[in-house]
């Protein structure tokens, strides 16, 4: 069952998923000047069974210039920088590392993909938060959020994380910079 809304936003933090539960949608979004092809699903779907899951449908982007029934209105300013090659490589490495029953790995990037990935998560999905570069965790309980079903409604639990700015990165004594996700599992690129 799809979660009704997106995971909570934490100032100066991003969230990541280790793997994606079956039923998760990943919108086929394209970078500026490109749009998804007119035939094919508007999203990829994590589908399968308990022994094997994979992403159904493939996202494809095409140049927007050649579309006669598609118009482009005044573009909004770019909000994010291009995803770096190293980040793309880390995604592909992740695909070899994560294998959870009933879950899909991070899909590899597609040509002319947008800078931000937009997911529709399902009930039971956990996402993990970490502070962006230049900020550190000032107060940390579980830095994660879970989509739960309560009384027929979905809700995300509130992550216990505050990210504070600093001129030089530093940690509390004995606290490592939160690079790896809980349980030592590798983390994946996500929509925030």
């Amino acid at each position: 069952e799809l979660c009704d809304d997106d995971p909570p936003k934490i100032t100066h933090a991003t969230f990541k998923a280790v793997a994606y539960k079956e039923g998760t949608m990943l919108n086929c979004e394209c970078k500026r000047g490109f749009r998804r092809i007119k035939s094919g699903s508007p999203y990829m779907l994590c589908t399968g069974n308990s022994s094997h899951s994979s992403w159904d449908n493939q996202c494809q982007c095409t140049s927007s210039a050649a579309r006669n029934t598609t118009k482009q209105v005044t573009p909004q300013p770019e909000e994010q920088k291009e995803r770096k090659t190293t980040e793309m490589q880390s995604q592909m490495q992740l695909a070899d590392q994560v294998s959870l029953p009933g879950h899909c790995r991070e899909p590899p990037p597609w040509e002319n993909e947008a800078t931000e990935r937009i997911y529709h998560f399902v009930v039971g999905q956990t996402v993990y938060y970490q502070c962006v570069q230049g900020y550190r965790a000032l107060h940390r309980g579980p830095a994660e959020s879970v989509c739960k079903m309560t009384h027929g409604k979905t809700r995300w639990t509130q992550p216990q994380l505050i990210c504070t700015g600093e001129t030089e990165p530093s940690q509390f004594p004995g606290e490592e910079e939160p690079q790896a996700s809980p349980d030592g599992l590798p983390e994946s690129e996500t929509s925030r």
Epitope: D5, M25, R35, G40, L45, K71
Partner: antibody
Framework: QIQLQQSGAELVRPGTSVKMSCKAA????????IGWVKQRPGHGLEWIGD????????NYNEKFTGKATLTADTSSSTAYMQLSSLTSEDSAIYYC???????WGQGTLVTVSA | DIVMSQSQKFMSTSVGDRVSVTCKAS??????VAWYQQKPGQSPKALIY???YRYSGVPDRFTGSGSGTDFTLTISNVQSEDLAEYFC?????????FGGGTKLEIK
């Protein structure tokens, strides 16, 4: 809570235009396509087109090209649809829809009458 | 354009029964099909996406199945509140198209 709040009913004259709104709340407006659907009794549901507020892209069902104009204002998280050269055939309920058709507005009833 | 055909405009059933609403696409749409429920005077409500996945809050008595051109929405243990019109929709290619609807009547 995700909501799509549409503007109120319109009674308009043939040959004129009408512009209706769809205000989104509870999600990142610029991330998701907003579609528009027409419903007339006995004619079922018809997809008019959709707009990506962040990317600025618009798709029209060719049947509605020249009839419908879709716009969006990211600063107010509001999508708009203007219908022009109205005839009795345009009398219908118009719905906005977002987040891969998961969320629907309550609809705007347009009545075209002399 | 892809035509989505719901051959039965009306279906009659009793509380507790099992009923299947069918939808046929004029060409292969994979599993890119959604089902909606519309009660009188209300907006359509999304029930199923990708042919077989339920939206949140949708009772598990609603089940979607099918791929390619033939799709089915099955309602098991029909309840009185299921009195509504049911629409299928393909979103495999533009323009997205809907079926004509099937009205479920409770005896």
């Amino acid at each position: 809570q995700i909501q799509l709040q549409q503007s109120g009913a319109e009674l308009v004259r043939p040959g004129t235009s009408v512009k209706m709104s769809c205000k989104a709340a509870g999600y990142t407006f610029s991330n998701y396509w907003i579609g528009w659907v027409k419903q007339r009794p006995g004619h079922g549901l018809e997809w008019i087109g959709d707009i990506h507020p962040g990317g600025g892209y618009i798709n029209y069902n060719e049947k509605f090209t020249g009839k419908a104009t879709l716009t969006a204002d990211t600063s107010s998280s509001t999508a708009y649809m203007q219908l022009s050269s109205l005839t009795s055939e345009d009398s219908a309920i118009y719905y906005c829809v977002s987040r891969n058709f998961a969320n629907w507005g309550q609809g705007t009833l347009v009545t075209v009458s002399a | 354009d892809i035509v989505m055909s719901q051959s039965q405009k009306f279906m009659s059933t009793s509380v507790g029964d099992r009923v299947s609403v069918t939808c046929k696409a004029s060409q292969n749409v994979g599993t890119n099909v959604a089902w909606y429920q519309q009660k009188p005077g209300q907006s359509p409500k999304a029930l199923i996406y990708s042919a077989s996945y339920r939206y949140s809050g949708v009772p598990d008595r609603f089940t979607g199945s099918g791929s390619g051109t033939d799709f089915t929405l099955t309602i098991s243990n029909v309840q009185s509140e299921d009195l509504a019109e049911y629409f299928c929709q393909q979103y495999n290619s533009y323009p997205y198209t809907f079926g004509g609807g099937t009205k479920l009547e409770i005896k």
